[in-house]
C-alpha cells in the first residue's frame, strides 16, 4: 500500500514560519500578508517506526521537491539537513532512520524528535531569520514546540 501523506505548514510557538534559506536549509521568521506564500509546505508521511498514542513516526519532505529533512552526524554533532532523494523511491513506508522523526503531541503543540538521535529535536531560535536546526535541549531558550496547519493538496 502507498504511504499515507498529508500536506501541512509548521509554525514555531513564537508564530515564526519556516522558509527556504538557500538550496538545502530552512530558516524561521515572522511572515505576514503576501509573504506567507514563502513558507514551505511539507509533505508529512506516516512511516514505519515505534508508535504510541502521542508519538507517531513521520518523515518530513518538501512538497513537490525531492528533499527530506534528515539527521546526520557532522563533526560528531547531530545535525539537521535537507537531503536530496530519488523521487522514484520516496516517500516509502520504511524510511531510513535518519529521515524519521517522532511527532510528539503535548498540549496541542507538536515536537519532532529525531529517531536517529533520541532527545534531539527540530528547533528554532528566539532570533529572527536564523536557521532551523537540531537541538539537544527542551524547555531552554531554543524553541522545540510547533503547530501544524493543514494545506489542501
Amino acid at each position: 500500500a502507498p504511504v499515507r501523506s498529508l500536506n501541512c505548514t509548521l509554525r514555531d510557538s513564537q508564530q515564526k514560519s519556516l522558509v527556504m534559506s538557500g538550496p538545502y536549509e530552512l530558516k524561521a521568521l515572522h511572515l505576514q500578508g503576501q509573504d506567507m506564500e514563502q513558507q514551505v509546505v511539507f509533505s508529512m508521511s506516516f512511516v514505519q517506526g515505534e508508535e504510541s498514542n502521542d508519538k507517531i513516526p513521520v518523515a518530513l519532505g518538501l512538497k513537490e521537491k525531492n528533499l527530506y529533512l534528515s539527521c546526520v552526524l557532522k563533526d560528531d554533532k547531530p545535525t539537521l539537513q535537507l537531503e536530496s532523494v530519488d523521487p522514484k523511491n520516496y516517500p516509502k513506508k520504511k524510511m531510513e532512520k535518519r529521515f524519521v522523526f517522532n511527532k510528539i503531541e503535548i498540549n496541542n503543540k507538536l515536537e519532532f524528535e529525531s529517531a536517529q538521535f533520541p532527545n534531539w529535536y527540530i528547533s528554532t531560535s528566539q532570533a529572527e531569520n536564523m536557521p532551523v536546526f537540531l537541538g539537544g535541549t527542551k524547555g531552554g531558550q531554543d524553541i522545540t514546540d510547533f503547530t501544524m496547519q493543514f494545506v489542501s493538496s
Partner: antibody
C-alpha cells in the same frame, strides 16, 4: 555598554593552531548569536562562522570548514574560535561580533591579528 | 553562495556632497541587507539593517533603500567623518557574504 574584547592572536607557522577568545560584557551574552568575521590586510570583510545562543547551531564559511571550530561558554561570557591547519591565507584581523536583528553585526570587538607565516 | 557586488569600488567627493553607493545581490535577498562603515584601523560600524532601518545613534543623513537584488546607501551632505570604506552584507542565508567595499575619499 556593550564590549567585546578579542585575544589570542599572534604569529603561527603554516599547519599550526591557535585559539581565539572574545570576552563579552554589557549585555546578556547567553541570549545572542555571535559571529567571527575576518579581514585580510588591505582587503574586505569575510564572514567566518556563527554560533547560536545554546551552541547547538553552528555554521562556517567554506574556506574554514573542517579546520575551524566555533564554541562558547555562556557561564564565562566568552566566545572561542579554535583554528587548526592554519594557512597563509588565514592571515587577517579576526573580529568577534554580536548578531543583531535578522543577521547583521550590531557590535564589534577591536579585532586580533593572526599572522600565518614561516 | 550569494555574491554581493558593490559599485563604485572607490569615489572622490567633497564635504556637502550627496553620495549614493549601490549593492547588488546575485539572487533575491528580500530586505536582509546591512550597511557598515569602516575607518582605517577600526572595526566596522553598523549603519543600516533590514535594508532601510537606521541603526540607533547613526546620523539621519545616512539612509538605505531597496529590496530583492538592488540596494542603495545614500549619504546626504557628506561630513568630514564620513570619509571611510562602506560595505554591504546579505543576511538572507548562510554563508553570509559582504560586498567588496566602496572607499570614499576626499576630492
Amino acid at each position: 555598554e556593550v564590549q567585546l574584547l578579542e585575544s589570542g592572536g599572534g604569529l603561527v607557522q603554516p599547519g599550526g593552531s591557535l585559539r581565539l577568545s572574545c570576552a563579552a560584557s554589557g549585555f546578556t551574552f547567553s541570549k545572542y548569536f555571535m559571529f567571527w568575521v575576518r579581514q585580510a590586510p588591505g582587503k574586505g570583510l569575510e564572514w567566518v562562522s556563527v554560533i547560536s545562543p545554546s551552541g547547538f547551531m553552528t555554521r562556517y564559511a567554506d574556506s574554514v570548514k573542517g579546520r575551524f571550530t566555533i564554541s562558547r561558554d555562556n557561564s564565562k561570557n566568552t566566545l572561542y574560535l579554535q583554528m587548526n591547519s592554519l594557512r597563509a591565507e588565514d592571515t587577517a584581523v579576526y573580529y568577534c561580533a554580536r548578531v543583531g536583528y535578522g543577521g547583521n553585526s550590531d557590535y564589534w570587538g577591536q579585532g586580533t591579528l593572526v599572522t600565518v607565516s614561516s | 553562495d550569494i555574491q554581493m557586488t558593490q559599485s563604485p569600488s572607490s569615489v572622490s567627493a567633497s564635504v556637502g556632497d550627496r553620495l549614493t553607493i549601490i549593492c547588488r545581490a546575485s539572487q533575491d535577498i528580500n530586505r536582509w541587507l546591512a550597511w557598515y562603515q569602516q575607518t582605517p584601523g577600526n572595526a566596522p560600524k553598523l549603519l543600516i539593517h533590514s535594508a532601510t532601518s537606521l541603526q540607533s545613534g547613526v546620523p539621519s543623513r545616512f539612509s538605505g533603500s531597496g529590496s530583492g537584488t538592488d540596494f542603495t546607501l545614500t549619504i546626504n551632505s557628506l561630513q568630514p567623518e564620513d570619509f571611510a570604506t562602506y560595505y554591504c552584507q546579505q543576511a538572507d542565508s548562510f554563508p553570509l557574504t559582504f560586498g567588496g567595499g566602496t572607499k570614499v575619499e576626499i576630492k
